[in-house]
Protein backbone atom coordinates (compact mmCIF):
# COMPACT_ATOMS: atom_id res chain seq x y z
CA UNK A 1 0.00 0.00 0.00
CA UNK A 2 1.64 3.35 -0.27
CA UNK A 3 0.99 5.80 2.25
CA UNK A 4 -1.64 9.24 1.65
CA UNK A 5 0.56 12.09 1.36
CA UNK A 6 -0.47 15.10 0.09
CA UNK A 7 0.62 16.63 -3.91
CA UNK A 8 3.85 19.26 -3.46
CA UNK A 9 2.69 22.48 -5.27
CA UNK A 10 2.66 22.36 -8.89
CA UNK A 11 3.33 18.98 -9.47
CA UNK A 12 -0.81 18.05 -9.81
CA UNK A 13 -0.54 16.39 -12.89
CA UNK A 14 -2.82 17.80 -15.57
CA UNK A 15 -2.45 15.09 -18.24
CA UNK A 16 -1.04 12.13 -18.64
CA UNK A 17 2.50 12.61 -20.02
CA UNK A 18 6.26 11.71 -20.26
CA UNK A 19 6.73 14.08 -16.72
CA UNK A 20 5.41 11.66 -14.96
CA UNK A 21 8.27 9.41 -15.48
CA UNK A 22 10.21 11.67 -12.92
CA UNK A 23 7.86 11.13 -10.10
CA UNK A 24 8.14 9.03 -7.25
CA UNK A 25 6.03 6.30 -6.33
CA UNK A 26 4.57 8.47 -3.62
CA UNK A 27 4.25 11.70 -6.02
CA UNK A 28 2.34 9.82 -8.53
CA UNK A 29 -0.30 8.76 -6.01
CA UNK A 30 -1.24 11.65 -4.86
CA UNK A 31 -0.45 13.92 -8.21
CA UNK A 32 -2.39 11.94 -10.35
CA UNK A 33 -5.98 11.48 -10.29
CA UNK A 34 -7.56 8.60 -11.15
CA UNK A 35 -10.50 9.51 -13.04
CA UNK A 36 -7.70 11.69 -15.27
CA UNK A 37 -5.86 8.32 -15.69
CA UNK A 38 -9.28 6.29 -16.65
CA UNK A 39 -9.63 8.76 -19.27
CA UNK A 40 -6.07 9.16 -20.71
CA UNK A 41 -5.22 5.14 -20.24
CA UNK A 42 -4.38 5.20 -23.77
CA UNK A 43 -1.39 7.55 -23.28
CA UNK A 44 0.47 5.24 -20.80
CA UNK A 45 1.42 2.86 -23.36
CA UNK A 46 3.70 5.56 -25.18
CA UNK A 47 5.00 6.42 -21.45
CA UNK A 48 8.55 4.72 -20.36
CA UNK A 49 7.04 4.04 -16.87
CA UNK A 50 8.60 1.30 -14.40
CA UNK A 51 7.22 -1.49 -13.17
CA UNK A 52 7.01 0.16 -9.73
CA UNK A 53 5.24 3.23 -11.32
CA UNK A 54 3.11 1.00 -13.13
CA UNK A 55 2.22 -0.55 -9.75
CA UNK A 56 0.84 3.09 -8.95
CA UNK A 57 -1.09 3.53 -11.56
CA UNK A 58 -2.99 -0.31 -11.07
CA UNK A 59 -3.48 0.79 -7.48
CA UNK A 60 -5.02 3.73 -8.64
CA UNK A 61 -7.07 2.31 -10.83
CA UNK A 62 -8.38 -0.19 -8.46
CA UNK A 63 -9.32 2.37 -5.95
CA UNK A 64 -11.38 3.96 -8.35
CA UNK A 65 -13.36 0.87 -9.75
CA UNK A 66 -13.41 -1.57 -6.90
CA UNK A 67 -15.71 -3.93 -8.56
CA UNK A 68 -14.00 -4.18 -11.72
CA UNK A 69 -13.35 -1.62 -14.50
CA UNK A 70 -15.63 -0.75 -17.40
CA UNK A 71 -14.57 -1.74 -21.10
CA UNK A 72 -13.31 1.69 -21.99
CA UNK A 73 -10.90 1.29 -19.69
CA UNK A 74 -9.52 -2.17 -20.24
CA UNK A 75 -9.61 -1.43 -24.31
CA UNK A 76 -6.53 0.72 -23.29
CA UNK A 77 -4.77 -1.14 -20.70
CA UNK A 78 -2.03 -2.13 -22.80
CA UNK A 79 0.47 -3.24 -20.93
CA UNK A 80 -0.75 -2.56 -18.03
CA UNK A 81 -2.90 -5.45 -18.46
CA UNK A 82 -0.24 -7.27 -17.36
CA UNK A 83 0.28 -6.07 -14.34
CA UNK A 84 -3.46 -7.21 -13.78
CA UNK A 85 -4.02 -10.89 -11.92
CA UNK A 86 -6.47 -13.30 -12.93
CA UNK A 87 -8.79 -12.03 -9.71
CA UNK A 88 -8.67 -8.74 -11.15
CA UNK A 89 -9.92 -9.75 -14.54
CA UNK A 90 -12.65 -11.82 -13.19
CA UNK A 91 -14.69 -9.06 -12.05
CA UNK A 92 -14.46 -7.86 -15.99
CA UNK A 93 -17.01 -7.79 -17.92
CA UNK A 94 -15.74 -7.74 -21.87
CA UNK A 95 -17.67 -7.71 -24.64
CA UNK A 96 -16.05 -6.24 -27.49
CA UNK A 97 -14.06 -8.39 -29.92
CA UNK A 98 -12.10 -5.10 -30.45
CA UNK A 99 -11.03 -5.65 -26.61
CA UNK A 100 -9.92 -8.41 -26.75
CA UNK A 101 -8.14 -8.18 -29.37
CA UNK A 102 -6.39 -5.30 -27.85
CA UNK A 103 -5.15 -7.31 -24.65
CA UNK A 104 -4.32 -10.12 -26.76
CA UNK A 105 -2.06 -7.77 -29.13
CA UNK A 106 -0.42 -7.06 -25.80
CA UNK A 107 1.04 -10.80 -25.31
CA UNK A 108 1.61 -11.33 -28.55
CA UNK A 109 3.81 -14.69 -29.56
CA UNK A 110 4.38 -15.47 -26.33
CA UNK A 111 2.40 -18.51 -24.48
CA UNK A 112 -1.00 -17.74 -23.36
CA UNK A 113 -0.35 -16.37 -20.00
CA UNK A 114 -3.01 -16.72 -16.80
CA UNK A 115 -4.08 -13.24 -17.67
CA UNK A 116 -4.69 -14.13 -21.11
CA UNK A 117 -6.44 -17.35 -20.24
CA UNK A 118 -8.73 -15.51 -17.90
CA UNK A 119 -9.89 -13.20 -20.01
CA UNK A 120 -9.98 -15.57 -22.79
CA UNK A 121 -12.90 -17.77 -20.55
CA UNK A 122 -14.55 -14.75 -19.54
CA UNK A 123 -15.10 -13.20 -22.44
CA UNK A 124 -16.02 -16.73 -24.08
CA UNK A 125 -18.61 -17.28 -21.17
CA UNK A 126 -20.32 -14.05 -21.70
CA UNK A 127 -20.99 -14.61 -25.46
CA UNK A 128 -22.41 -17.63 -24.48
CA UNK A 129 -20.81 -19.89 -27.40
CA UNK A 130 -17.62 -19.62 -29.45
CA UNK A 131 -18.63 -18.02 -32.30
CA UNK A 132 -16.75 -17.65 -35.46
CA UNK A 133 -15.10 -14.58 -35.25
CA UNK A 134 -13.89 -15.11 -31.51
CA UNK A 135 -12.33 -18.46 -33.08
CA UNK A 136 -10.93 -16.47 -35.58
CA UNK A 137 -9.27 -14.08 -33.26
CA UNK A 138 -8.10 -16.60 -30.64
CA UNK A 139 -6.44 -18.95 -33.26
CA UNK A 140 -4.60 -16.12 -35.08
CA UNK A 141 -3.08 -15.25 -31.75
CA UNK A 142 -2.58 -18.54 -30.30
CA UNK A 143 -2.60 -21.35 -32.57
CA UNK A 144 -3.48 -24.07 -30.15
CA UNK A 145 -5.74 -22.90 -28.30
CA UNK A 146 -8.68 -24.94 -29.38
CA UNK A 147 -6.61 -28.17 -28.05
CA UNK A 148 -6.54 -26.42 -25.12
CA UNK A 149 -10.36 -26.57 -24.39
CA UNK A 150 -11.98 -29.72 -22.88
CA UNK A 151 -14.63 -31.34 -24.76
CA UNK A 152 -17.39 -30.11 -22.89
CA UNK A 153 -16.35 -26.23 -23.70
CA UNK A 154 -15.62 -27.47 -27.41
CA UNK A 155 -19.00 -28.89 -27.75
CA UNK A 156 -20.15 -25.46 -27.63
CA UNK A 157 -18.68 -24.47 -30.81
CA UNK A 158 -21.23 -24.36 -33.46
CA UNK A 159 -20.65 -25.70 -36.62
CA UNK A 160 -20.53 -22.78 -38.71
CA UNK A 161 -17.10 -21.79 -36.35
CA UNK A 162 -15.06 -25.04 -37.62
CA UNK A 163 -14.55 -22.82 -40.76
CA UNK A 164 -11.93 -20.68 -38.81
CA UNK A 165 -9.85 -23.31 -38.15
CA UNK A 166 -6.77 -24.14 -39.98
CA UNK A 167 -4.88 -27.44 -40.04
CA UNK A 168 -1.82 -26.31 -37.66
CA UNK A 169 -5.04 -25.11 -34.79
CA UNK A 170 -5.50 -28.73 -34.42
CA UNK A 171 -1.35 -30.13 -34.11
CA UNK A 172 -2.04 -30.88 -30.23
CA UNK A 173 -5.41 -32.14 -30.21
CA UNK A 174 -6.39 -35.38 -28.79
CA UNK A 175 -8.33 -38.45 -29.69
CA UNK A 176 -11.62 -36.98 -27.53
CA UNK A 177 -11.16 -33.17 -28.31
CA UNK A 178 -11.27 -34.60 -32.02
CA UNK A 179 -14.35 -36.58 -31.72
CA UNK A 180 -16.23 -33.50 -30.49
CA UNK A 181 -14.87 -31.75 -33.42
CA UNK A 182 -15.36 -34.23 -36.18
CA UNK A 183 -18.85 -34.11 -36.06
CA UNK A 184 -18.93 -30.79 -36.73
CA UNK A 185 -16.47 -30.22 -39.32
CA UNK A 186 -18.55 -33.14 -41.25
CA UNK A 187 -21.47 -31.07 -41.28
CA UNK A 188 -20.03 -27.76 -41.66
CA UNK A 189 -18.12 -29.36 -44.59
CA UNK A 190 -20.77 -31.50 -46.30
CA UNK A 191 -21.99 -29.36 -49.41
CA UNK A 192 -18.24 -29.35 -50.44
CA UNK A 193 -17.14 -31.96 -53.38
CA UNK A 194 -15.16 -34.85 -53.26
CA UNK A 195 -11.72 -33.25 -53.42
CA UNK A 196 -12.32 -29.43 -51.44
CA UNK A 197 -14.02 -31.50 -48.92
CA UNK A 198 -11.29 -34.20 -48.34
CA UNK A 199 -8.34 -31.00 -47.70
CA UNK A 200 -10.98 -29.50 -45.19
CA UNK A 201 -12.02 -32.48 -43.30
CA UNK A 202 -8.41 -34.06 -43.58
CA UNK A 203 -7.39 -32.06 -40.33
CA UNK A 204 -10.37 -33.51 -38.62
CA UNK A 205 -9.89 -37.21 -39.50
CA UNK A 206 -8.63 -38.29 -35.70
CA UNK A 207 -12.43 -38.08 -34.83
CA UNK A 208 -14.02 -39.87 -38.05
CA UNK A 209 -15.88 -43.58 -37.37
CA UNK A 210 -14.84 -46.48 -39.97
CA UNK A 211 -18.35 -46.13 -41.87
CA UNK A 212 -16.54 -42.53 -42.71
CA UNK A 213 -12.92 -44.00 -43.79
CA UNK A 214 -14.69 -46.49 -45.49
CA UNK A 215 -16.62 -43.79 -47.77
CA UNK A 216 -13.69 -41.84 -48.01
CA UNK A 217 -12.25 -45.14 -49.36
CA UNK A 218 -14.25 -44.92 -52.65
CA UNK A 219 -13.35 -41.54 -53.59
CA UNK A 220 -9.61 -41.80 -54.96
CA UNK A 221 -8.66 -39.07 -51.81
CA UNK A 222 -4.82 -40.39 -50.98
CA UNK A 223 -4.78 -39.69 -47.84
CA UNK A 224 -0.84 -39.04 -46.64
CA UNK A 225 0.65 -40.97 -43.98
CA UNK A 226 0.75 -38.66 -41.39
CA UNK A 227 -3.20 -38.21 -41.61
CA UNK A 228 -3.51 -41.87 -41.24
CA UNK A 229 -1.04 -42.17 -38.02
CA UNK A 230 -3.78 -39.92 -36.55
CA UNK A 231 -7.12 -41.83 -37.42
CA UNK A 232 -8.11 -43.47 -34.53
CA UNK A 233 -7.25 -47.39 -34.02
CA UNK A 234 -10.65 -48.33 -33.46
CA UNK A 235 -11.90 -46.64 -36.70
CA UNK A 236 -8.67 -48.55 -38.79
CA UNK A 237 -9.09 -52.28 -37.40
CA UNK A 238 -12.53 -53.03 -39.17
CA UNK A 239 -11.03 -51.79 -42.78
CA UNK A 240 -9.88 -54.23 -45.25
CA UNK A 241 -6.90 -53.87 -47.14
CA UNK A 242 -8.41 -53.33 -50.29
CA UNK A 243 -10.16 -50.17 -48.48
CA UNK A 244 -6.43 -49.07 -46.86
CA UNK A 245 -4.69 -49.62 -50.54
CA UNK A 246 -7.86 -47.10 -51.59
CA UNK A 247 -7.92 -44.92 -48.67
CA UNK A 248 -4.26 -43.87 -49.35
CA UNK A 249 -3.63 -44.54 -52.81
CA UNK A 250 0.01 -44.09 -53.54
CA UNK A 251 0.78 -43.06 -49.91
CA UNK A 252 -0.10 -47.01 -49.13
CA UNK A 253 4.38 -47.96 -49.79
CA UNK A 254 4.51 -45.35 -46.52
CA UNK A 255 2.40 -48.45 -44.30
CA UNK A 256 6.05 -50.01 -44.30
CA UNK A 257 7.98 -47.87 -42.71
CA UNK A 258 5.30 -48.01 -39.96
CA UNK A 259 4.51 -51.30 -39.51
CA UNK A 260 5.62 -51.14 -35.60
CA UNK A 261 3.51 -48.44 -34.82
CA UNK A 262 -0.07 -47.38 -34.12
CA UNK A 263 -2.99 -47.92 -35.68
CA UNK A 264 -0.78 -49.77 -38.48
CA UNK A 265 0.70 -52.38 -36.20
CA UNK A 266 -2.70 -53.40 -34.85
CA UNK A 267 -4.08 -53.39 -37.95
CA UNK A 268 -1.62 -55.60 -39.49
CA UNK A 269 -2.41 -58.23 -36.65
CA UNK A 270 -5.94 -58.08 -37.77
CA UNK A 271 -5.37 -58.98 -41.38
CA UNK A 272 -4.95 -61.94 -43.41
CA UNK A 273 -1.29 -62.56 -44.80
CA UNK A 274 -2.13 -63.54 -47.73
CA UNK A 275 -4.48 -60.01 -48.30
CA UNK A 276 -1.18 -58.17 -46.79
CA UNK A 277 0.87 -59.94 -49.31
CA UNK A 278 -1.28 -58.59 -52.36
CA UNK A 279 0.53 -55.00 -51.24
CA UNK A 280 3.73 -56.44 -52.37
CA UNK A 281 5.44 -54.25 -49.40
CA UNK A 282 6.46 -57.57 -47.20
CA UNK A 283 4.07 -56.39 -43.68
CA UNK A 284 4.55 -59.22 -42.02
CA UNK A 285 2.22 -60.60 -38.81
CA UNK A 286 -0.96 -61.48 -40.32
CA UNK A 287 -3.53 -63.82 -39.61
CA UNK A 288 -1.91 -66.55 -40.94
CA UNK A 289 -3.74 -68.72 -44.01
CA UNK A 290 -5.87 -71.50 -42.90
CA UNK A 291 -6.46 -69.76 -39.78
CA UNK A 292 -10.33 -68.98 -38.51
CA UNK A 293 -11.47 -65.36 -37.50
CA UNK A 294 -14.21 -65.09 -35.02
CA UNK A 295 -15.67 -62.09 -34.21
CA UNK A 296 -16.22 -62.51 -30.89
CA UNK A 297 -17.75 -58.69 -30.23
CA UNK A 298 -20.38 -59.56 -32.71
CA UNK A 299 -21.14 -63.22 -31.04
CA UNK A 300 -21.25 -60.77 -27.59
CA UNK A 301 -23.46 -58.82 -29.42
CA UNK A 302 -26.03 -61.35 -30.72
CA UNK A 303 -26.26 -63.64 -27.77
CA UNK B 1 26.47 1.49 -7.35
CA UNK B 2 24.43 -1.19 -9.09
CA UNK B 3 26.48 -4.85 -9.30
CA UNK B 4 25.35 -8.13 -11.19
CA UNK B 5 27.64 -10.96 -10.77
CA UNK B 6 27.13 -14.09 -12.04
CA UNK B 7 27.77 -17.34 -11.68
CA UNK B 8 27.07 -21.40 -12.11
CA UNK B 9 28.90 -21.78 -15.30
CA UNK B 10 31.23 -24.38 -16.69
CA UNK B 11 31.18 -27.11 -18.97
CA UNK B 12 28.51 -29.67 -19.09
CA UNK B 13 27.23 -32.47 -21.47
CA UNK B 14 24.37 -32.17 -23.78
CA UNK B 15 21.03 -33.56 -22.61
CA UNK B 16 22.51 -32.39 -19.31
CA UNK B 17 20.93 -29.28 -16.74
CA UNK B 18 22.83 -26.18 -15.32
CA UNK B 19 21.64 -23.60 -13.36
CA UNK B 20 22.77 -19.83 -13.60
CA UNK B 21 22.49 -17.60 -10.63
CA UNK B 22 23.11 -13.73 -10.93
CA UNK B 23 23.15 -12.12 -7.11
CA UNK B 24 22.47 -8.25 -7.18
CA UNK B 25 22.84 -5.02 -5.25
CA UNK B 26 23.60 -1.60 -5.24
CA UNK B 27 19.34 -1.24 -6.34
CA UNK B 28 16.04 -2.03 -4.92
CA UNK B 29 15.87 -5.37 -6.98
CA UNK B 30 12.24 -6.31 -6.15
CA UNK B 31 11.46 -3.00 -8.10
CA UNK B 32 13.36 -4.53 -11.34
CA UNK B 33 13.14 -7.00 -14.20
CA UNK B 34 16.01 -9.04 -15.11
CA UNK B 35 16.94 -10.12 -18.13
CA UNK B 36 19.90 -13.29 -19.51
CA UNK B 37 21.07 -12.56 -22.52
CA UNK B 38 24.13 -14.62 -23.75
CA UNK B 39 26.61 -14.22 -26.60
CA UNK B 40 28.35 -17.47 -28.59
CA UNK B 41 32.14 -17.17 -29.32
CA UNK B 42 32.98 -14.92 -32.04
CA UNK B 43 29.02 -13.74 -32.40
CA UNK B 44 26.58 -11.33 -31.45
CA UNK B 45 24.53 -10.72 -28.54
CA UNK B 46 21.12 -13.06 -28.40
CA UNK B 47 18.33 -12.21 -26.00
CA UNK B 48 17.13 -15.26 -23.85
CA UNK B 49 14.64 -14.46 -21.23
CA UNK B 50 12.97 -11.50 -19.45
CA UNK B 51 11.48 -11.68 -15.65
CA UNK B 52 9.38 -8.96 -14.06
CA UNK B 53 9.90 -7.22 -10.90
CA UNK B 54 7.19 -9.61 -9.01
CA UNK B 55 7.91 -12.31 -11.36
CA UNK B 56 4.47 -12.16 -12.90
CA UNK B 57 5.51 -12.56 -16.26
CA UNK B 58 8.78 -14.14 -17.98
CA UNK B 59 8.87 -14.27 -21.53
CA UNK B 60 11.70 -16.43 -23.67
CA UNK B 61 13.33 -16.39 -27.08
CA UNK B 62 11.79 -19.29 -29.01
CA UNK B 63 15.28 -20.57 -29.43
CA UNK B 64 14.78 -21.42 -25.29
CA UNK B 65 11.01 -22.06 -24.95
CA UNK B 66 9.84 -25.25 -22.47
CA UNK B 67 14.43 -25.72 -22.07
CA UNK B 68 15.14 -22.63 -20.15
CA UNK B 69 12.96 -21.59 -17.06
CA UNK B 70 13.94 -18.20 -15.46
CA UNK B 71 13.22 -16.91 -12.15
CA UNK B 72 14.11 -14.68 -9.09
CA UNK B 73 14.04 -14.71 -5.30
CA UNK B 74 13.80 -11.08 -4.36
CA UNK B 75 14.24 -12.28 -0.32
CA UNK B 76 17.91 -12.68 -1.62
CA UNK B 77 18.54 -10.33 -4.45
CA UNK B 78 19.55 -13.18 -6.86
CA UNK B 79 18.26 -14.13 -10.51
CA UNK B 80 18.06 -17.66 -11.29
CA UNK B 81 18.07 -19.52 -15.18
CA UNK B 82 17.72 -22.95 -15.19
CA UNK B 83 18.96 -24.70 -18.02
CA UNK B 84 17.64 -28.25 -19.56
CA UNK B 85 18.40 -30.48 -21.90
CA UNK B 86 21.45 -28.12 -23.07
CA UNK B 87 22.45 -28.58 -26.90
CA UNK B 88 26.14 -27.60 -28.16
CA UNK B 89 24.43 -24.39 -29.51
CA UNK B 90 23.88 -23.27 -26.16
CA UNK B 91 27.66 -22.57 -25.26
CA UNK B 92 28.03 -19.07 -24.77
CA UNK B 93 28.95 -16.47 -22.29
CA UNK B 94 25.28 -15.26 -20.29
CA UNK B 95 25.16 -12.51 -18.86
CA UNK B 96 21.84 -10.56 -16.55
CA UNK B 97 20.88 -7.41 -17.36
CA UNK B 98 18.49 -5.14 -15.54
CA UNK B 99 15.79 -3.03 -16.85
CA UNK B 100 13.27 -1.01 -14.89
CA UNK B 101 9.89 -1.03 -17.23
CA UNK B 102 8.51 -2.53 -20.14
CA UNK B 103 9.94 0.37 -22.18
CA UNK B 104 13.02 0.46 -20.67
CA UNK B 105 16.58 -0.66 -22.01
CA UNK B 106 18.96 -3.01 -20.53
CA UNK B 107 20.90 -0.36 -18.44
CA UNK B 108 23.23 -2.55 -15.95
CA UNK B 109 24.73 -5.51 -17.29
CA UNK B 110 27.07 -7.99 -14.92
CA UNK B 111 30.45 -9.73 -16.62
CA UNK B 112 29.03 -12.89 -17.92
CA UNK B 113 29.46 -16.58 -16.92
CA UNK B 114 30.66 -19.23 -19.33
CA UNK B 115 28.40 -22.51 -20.46
CA UNK B 116 29.96 -24.70 -22.52
CA UNK B 117 27.96 -27.61 -23.28
CA UNK B 118 30.47 -30.27 -25.45
CA UNK B 119 30.78 -34.21 -25.02
CA UNK C 1 9.21 -11.47 -33.30
CA UNK C 2 10.77 -8.25 -34.17
CA UNK C 3 13.94 -8.90 -36.39
CA UNK C 4 17.12 -5.90 -35.94
CA UNK C 5 19.63 -5.33 -39.10
CA UNK C 6 22.37 -3.71 -38.52
CA UNK C 7 24.99 -2.38 -41.48
CA UNK C 8 27.66 -2.60 -42.30
CA UNK C 9 28.38 -5.78 -39.94
CA UNK C 10 32.56 -4.39 -40.27
CA UNK C 11 33.52 -0.68 -40.54
CA UNK C 12 36.94 0.56 -40.95
CA UNK C 13 38.06 3.78 -39.87
CA UNK C 14 40.82 6.53 -38.26
CA UNK C 15 40.96 8.26 -35.52
CA UNK C 16 38.62 11.84 -35.97
CA UNK C 17 36.63 10.60 -38.30
CA UNK C 18 32.70 10.58 -38.40
CA UNK C 19 31.00 7.37 -38.19
CA UNK C 20 27.45 5.76 -39.21
CA UNK C 21 25.68 2.86 -38.47
CA UNK C 22 22.15 1.97 -39.49
CA UNK C 23 19.81 -0.25 -38.16
CA UNK C 24 16.57 -1.20 -39.17
CA UNK C 25 13.33 -3.01 -37.30
CA UNK C 26 11.07 -5.25 -39.39
CA UNK C 27 8.16 -3.57 -37.91
CA UNK C 28 7.98 0.09 -36.54
CA UNK C 29 8.79 0.43 -32.62
CA UNK C 30 8.32 4.20 -32.33
CA UNK C 31 11.59 5.08 -30.65
CA UNK C 32 12.14 2.20 -28.74
CA UNK C 33 15.95 1.48 -29.47
CA UNK C 34 19.17 1.37 -27.69
CA UNK C 35 22.62 1.31 -28.31
CA UNK C 36 25.55 -0.57 -27.08
CA UNK C 37 29.13 -0.69 -27.20
CA UNK C 38 30.88 -4.05 -26.41
CA UNK C 39 34.85 -4.13 -26.14
CA UNK C 40 36.40 -7.47 -26.00
CA UNK C 41 36.00 -9.64 -23.07
CA UNK C 42 33.63 -7.48 -21.50
CA UNK C 43 29.80 -6.93 -20.84
CA UNK C 44 28.49 -4.53 -22.95
CA UNK C 45 27.53 -0.76 -22.25
CA UNK C 46 24.48 1.03 -22.75
CA UNK C 47 25.37 4.07 -25.31
CA UNK C 48 21.85 5.33 -26.27
CA UNK C 49 18.15 4.97 -25.38
CA UNK C 50 15.25 5.70 -27.06
CA UNK C 51 16.73 6.51 -30.12
CA UNK C 52 18.76 9.38 -29.51
CA UNK C 53 18.80 10.35 -25.06
CA UNK C 54 22.50 9.97 -24.05
CA UNK C 55 23.08 7.61 -21.17
CA UNK C 56 24.60 9.52 -18.46
CA UNK C 57 28.16 9.63 -18.66
CA UNK C 58 28.71 8.52 -22.50
CA UNK C 59 30.38 11.07 -24.39
CA UNK C 60 28.36 13.50 -26.74
CA UNK C 61 30.29 12.77 -29.74
CA UNK C 62 27.51 9.55 -29.27
CA UNK C 63 24.29 10.41 -31.19
CA UNK C 64 21.55 8.60 -32.10
CA UNK C 65 18.35 9.30 -34.31
CA UNK C 66 15.35 7.54 -36.39
CA UNK C 67 12.24 6.33 -35.40
CA UNK C 68 9.66 3.70 -36.76
CA UNK C 69 11.99 1.62 -38.67
CA UNK C 70 15.04 3.46 -39.72
CA UNK C 71 18.09 4.29 -36.66
CA UNK C 72 21.17 5.37 -36.79
CA UNK C 73 24.52 5.54 -34.58
CA UNK C 74 26.57 8.12 -34.79
CA UNK C 75 30.14 8.80 -33.60
CA UNK C 76 31.29 12.34 -34.76
CA UNK C 77 34.47 12.36 -34.13
CA UNK C 78 36.07 8.96 -33.35
CA UNK C 79 38.60 8.54 -30.63
CA UNK C 80 40.89 5.48 -29.72
CA UNK C 81 38.62 4.19 -26.87
CA UNK C 82 35.65 4.05 -29.22
CA UNK C 83 37.11 1.10 -31.51
CA UNK C 84 34.85 -1.62 -30.43
CA UNK C 85 32.00 -3.46 -31.73
CA UNK C 86 28.08 -2.09 -31.50
CA UNK C 87 24.81 -3.16 -31.26
CA UNK C 88 21.02 -1.64 -31.73
CA UNK C 89 18.06 -3.59 -29.64
CA UNK C 90 14.38 -2.98 -30.06
CA UNK C 91 12.54 -2.99 -26.49
CA UNK C 92 9.14 -2.23 -27.74
CA UNK C 93 8.01 -5.61 -27.29
CA UNK C 94 8.91 -7.84 -24.76
CA UNK C 95 11.27 -10.35 -26.59
CA UNK C 96 14.24 -7.68 -26.53
CA UNK C 97 15.93 -8.63 -30.35
CA UNK C 98 19.19 -7.44 -31.15
CA UNK C 99 20.83 -6.65 -34.26
CA UNK C 100 23.93 -8.65 -35.45
CA UNK C 101 26.24 -6.35 -34.33
CA UNK C 102 28.66 -3.69 -36.36
CA UNK C 103 32.34 -3.95 -35.77
CA UNK C 104 34.38 -0.60 -35.79
CA UNK C 105 38.02 -1.30 -36.43
CA UNK C 106 41.08 0.69 -37.08
CA UNK C 107 41.63 1.59 -41.05
Known amino acids: EVEKTACPSGKKAREIDESLIFYKKWELEACVDAALLATQMDRVNAIPFTYEQLDVLKHKLDELYPQGYPESVIQHLGYLFLKMSPEDIRKWNVTSLETLKALLEVNKGHEMSPQVATLIDRFVKGRGQLDKDTLDTLTAFYPGYLCSLSPEELSSVPPSSIWAVRPQDLDTCDPRQLDVLYPKARLAFQNMNGSEYFVKIQSFLGGAPTEDLKALSQQNVSMDLATFMKLRTDAVLPLTVAEVQKLLGPHVEGLKAEERHRPVRDWILRQRQDDLDTLGLGLQGGIPNGYLVLDLSMQEALS | QVQLVESGGGVVQPGRSLRLSCAAS????????MNWVRQAPGKGLEWVAVIWNDASNKYYADSVKGRFTISRDNSKNTLYLQMNSLRAEDTAVYYC????????????WGQGTLVTVSS | DIQMTQSPSTLSASVGDRVTITCRASQSISRWLAWYQQKPGKAPKLLIYKASSLESGVPSRFSGSGSGTEFTLTISNLQPDDFATFYC?????????FGQGTKVEIK
Open chain 2, 97 to 108: ARDRGPLWPLDY
Open chain 3, 89 to 97: QQYNSYSRT
Open chain 2, 26 to 33: GFTFSSDA
